[in-house]
C-alpha cells in the first residue's frame, strides 16, 4: 500500500530589503497565465543566487505570494504583478503561502522511531 | 556558450527609423532571454528592451517606449530592434545580450549583470 502525500499549508509574513539589484527573485501566476489549474494566483518561480530573498532565506520556489505591502494580489493580470513588485518600494512586505508536502506512511503503519504504542 | 554580433547602427537625421539586428549563435536561441542595452559617452550602460519567448513578456525602458520596438525571428536565430523617430539622446553604442530564460518573469528591472552573453555593440548616431 502507498503512503497518501498530505499538504501542510503555512502563511507568513516576509520583510525584503531591496537589492542594489532588486528583490531577486521571479514569479509566474496571473489571471491572463494561470499556473495551477483554476488558480490565477501569484507563484514564486526561482530564486536568484545572491538576491535579496535569498539572502533572507525564508521565500521559496514554489510559494504562492497573497499580497505585496498590504495590496491583495488576487485577480492581477501577469503584468501588473510584476509592476506591483517593481514599484514596491524599498522595504517590501511579502504575505506568503508556504506548500509543504508531507509524506504519511500507509494506514495501520507506525514509522520507525514514532513514540507512540 | 552564445556568440551574439550586432549590426545595423549608423549615422541619422533626427526623426529617422534604424533596424538594428543581433545574430546569435551557440545556443538553443528560444531558451534564451534576449534585450538591448546602449551606452552613451561618458555614461553608464542601460537596458533599452527585453524579449522573453519562453515567458511572452517583453519590457521596454520609459525613454523608448512608443518608439523602440523589440522582437525576434527564432528561425533565424535573431533579435530586432526597430528605432522609430530617433532622437540626439538616443546617440550610443548598443549592444544586445542574452541570458538563459528561466521561469517567470523578474520582479526587478532589467539589469545588465543578470546577463551572461553580450555583443561587441554597434554604433548609433542621430544628429
Known amino acids: 500500500m502507498n503512503g497518501r502525500v498530505d499538504y501542510l499549508v503555512t502563511e507568513e509574513e516576509i520583510n525584503l530589503t531591496r537589492g542594489p539589484s532588486g528583490l531577486g527573485f521571479n514569479i509566474v501566476g496571473g489571471t491572463d497565465q494561470q499556473y495551477v489549474s483554476n488558480d490565477s494566483g501569484i507563484y514564486v518561480s526561482r530564486i536568484k543566487e545572491n538576491g535579496a530573498a535569498a539572502l533572507d532565506g525564508r521565500l521559496q520556489e514554489g510559494d504562492k505570494i497573497l499580497s505585496v505591502n498590504g495590496q491583495d494580489l488576487k485577480n492581477l493580470l501577469h503584468q501588473d504583478a510584476v509592476d506591483l513588485f517593481r514599484n514596491a518600494g524599498y522595504a517590501v512586505s511579502l504575505r506568503v503561502q508556504h506548500r509543504l508536502q508531507v509524506q504519511n506512511g500507509p494506514i495501520g503503519h507506525r514509522g520507525e522511531g514514532d513514540p507512540s504504542g | 556558450h552564445v556568440q551574439l554580433v550586432e549590426s545595423g547602427g549608423g549615422l541619422v537625421q533626427a526623426g529617422a527609423s534604424l533596424r538594428l539586428s543581433c545574430a546569435a549563435s551557440?545556443?538553443?536561441?528560444?531558451?534564451?532571454?534576449m534585450a538591448w542595452f546602449r551606452q552613451a559617452p561618458g555614461k553608464e550602460r542601460e537596458f533599452v528592451a527585453e524579449?522573453?519567448?519562453?515567458?511572452?513578456?517583453?519590457w521596454y525602458s520609459d525613454s523608448v517606449k512608443g518608439r523602440f520596438t523589440i522582437s525576434r525571428d527564432n528561425a533565424k536565430n535573431t533579435v530586432y530592434l526597430q528605432m522609430n523617430n530617433l532622437k540626439p539622446e538616443d546617440t550610443a553604442v548598443y549592444y544586445c545580450a542574452a541570458d538563459r530564460d528561466y521561469s517567470g518573469s523578474t520582479v526587478d528591472p532589467p539589469n545588465q549583470s543578470e546577463y551572461d552573453y553580450w555583443g561587441q555593440g554597434t554604433q548609433v548616431t542621430v544628429s
Open positions: 524579449d522573453s519567448w519562453s515567458n511572452h513578456r517583453v
Open positions: 551557440g545556443g538553443t536561441f528560444s531558451s534564451y532571454a
